[in-house]
């Protein structure tokens, strides 16, 4: 029978957990990305921010997973109004913030 969308969100959460737990050296060599508003449309915004990080295998799967939650194609250099364009943070902090928010959504049953 059908399975609730929660399982897909759980996969994304588990991938972010893996990244934070397996972090030894600075994630993505300490690359900086634009901070985003964790509101509606955040999946596309998160992808738009992370897509600008290249050569970082640790977040490749996350980038691909996020694409499955964003209806449009996202390319490097593409930005939406959901970015806090005056604030850049390290990828590691970005991942932690996103993880905390997704866990909150998961607990509240907000899967869409």
């Amino acid at each position: 029978g059908p399975v609730p969308p929660s399982t897909a969100l759980r996969e994304l959460i588990e991938e972010l957990v893996n990244i934070t737990q397996n972090q030894k050296a600075p994630l993505c060599n300490g690359s900086m990305v634009w901070s985003i508003n964790l509101t509606a449309g955040m999946y596309c915004a998160a992808l738009e921010s992370l897509i600008n990080v290249s050569g970082c295998s640790a977040i490749e799967k996350t980038q691909r997973m996020l694409s499955g939650f964003c209806p449009h194609k996202v390319s490097a250099g593409q930005f939406s109004s959901l970015h806090v364009r005056d604030t850049k943070i390290e990828v590691a902090q970005f991942v932690k913030d996103l993880l905390l928010h997704l866990k909150k959504l998961f607990r509240e049953g907000q899967f869409n």
Partner: antibody
């Protein structure tokens, strides 16, 4: 390790039916969309059908719409393809493929393919 | 229905560069994917999201996508790269595969 194992192929007469199965392991099957892709002898790849892992949405190529039915049993980690009213042009190797996550699973990329099962439609 | 067109064959000498094109209406607005298939084997994803390589795919494989054309480039082509290559995209609730290109390493 992610693995997909197809079964159920064989020889069937035109107008006949066949049900293909795909046993999945090594990943959370229920989370991912799954597809069937076929390849006729000496020909290119042709997508047949997909089943979302986000909801119960199913998708079909025009060439099989109304004849083929995709389904899945998440408790058994198994994907199915029920093929009815088979034609000679359905003769092909049928691959089971792991698709992506989320409502827009098609943005992810077909990462993992099974070895395929051969369907021959002939009298 | 949406169509993706590829050249039937491309020949390349070892060490040289092979380029395979995939043409479709406004393809650049969609994600493009590339698969490699060797005789008797299942297809393998070599490029996703236009230009990204899955882990384990050699750096000599690269991709681009803009306008109506996606391109797969194999730099420093090796004998082991001889295979059929297919592009793929999603349009109107269906996956579409390209017509396929046979790459021959002379």
């Amino acid at each position: 390790e992610v693995q997909l194992l197809e079964s159920g192929g064989g020889l069937v007469q035109p107008g006949g039916s066949l049900r293909l199965s795909c046993a999945a392991s090594g990943f959370t099957f229920s989370s991912y969309a799954m597809s069937w892709v076929r390849q006729a002898p000496g020909k290119g790849l042709e997508w047949v059908s997909a089943f979302s892992g986000w909801d119960v949405s199913t998708y079909y190529a025009d060439s099989v719409k109304g004849r083929f039915t995709i389904s899945r049993d998440n408790s058994k980690n198994t994907l199915y393809l029920q093929m009815n009213s088979l034609r000679a042009e359905d003769t092909a190797v049928y691959y089971c493929v792991q698709d992506g996550l989320g409502p827009y699973f098609y943005n992810y990329g077909m990462d993992v393919w099974g070895q395929g099962t051969t369907v021959t439609v002939s009298s | 229905s949406y169509e993706l067109t590829q050249p039937p064959s491309v020949s390349v000498s070892p060490g040289q560069t092979a380029s395979i094109t995939c043409s479709g209406d406004k393809l650049g607005d969609k994600y493009s994917f590339w698969f490699q298939q060797k005789p008797g084997q299942s297809p393998v994803l070599v490029i996703y999201h236009d230009s990204k390589r899955p882990s384990g795919i050699p750096e000599r494989f690269s991709g681009s996508n803009s306008g109506d054309t996606a391109t797969l480039t194999i730099s420093g082509t090796q004998a082991m790269d001889e295979a059929d290559y297919y592009c793929q995209a999603w349009d109107s609730s269906t996956y579409v595969f390209g017509t396929g290109t046979k790459v021959t390493v002379l």
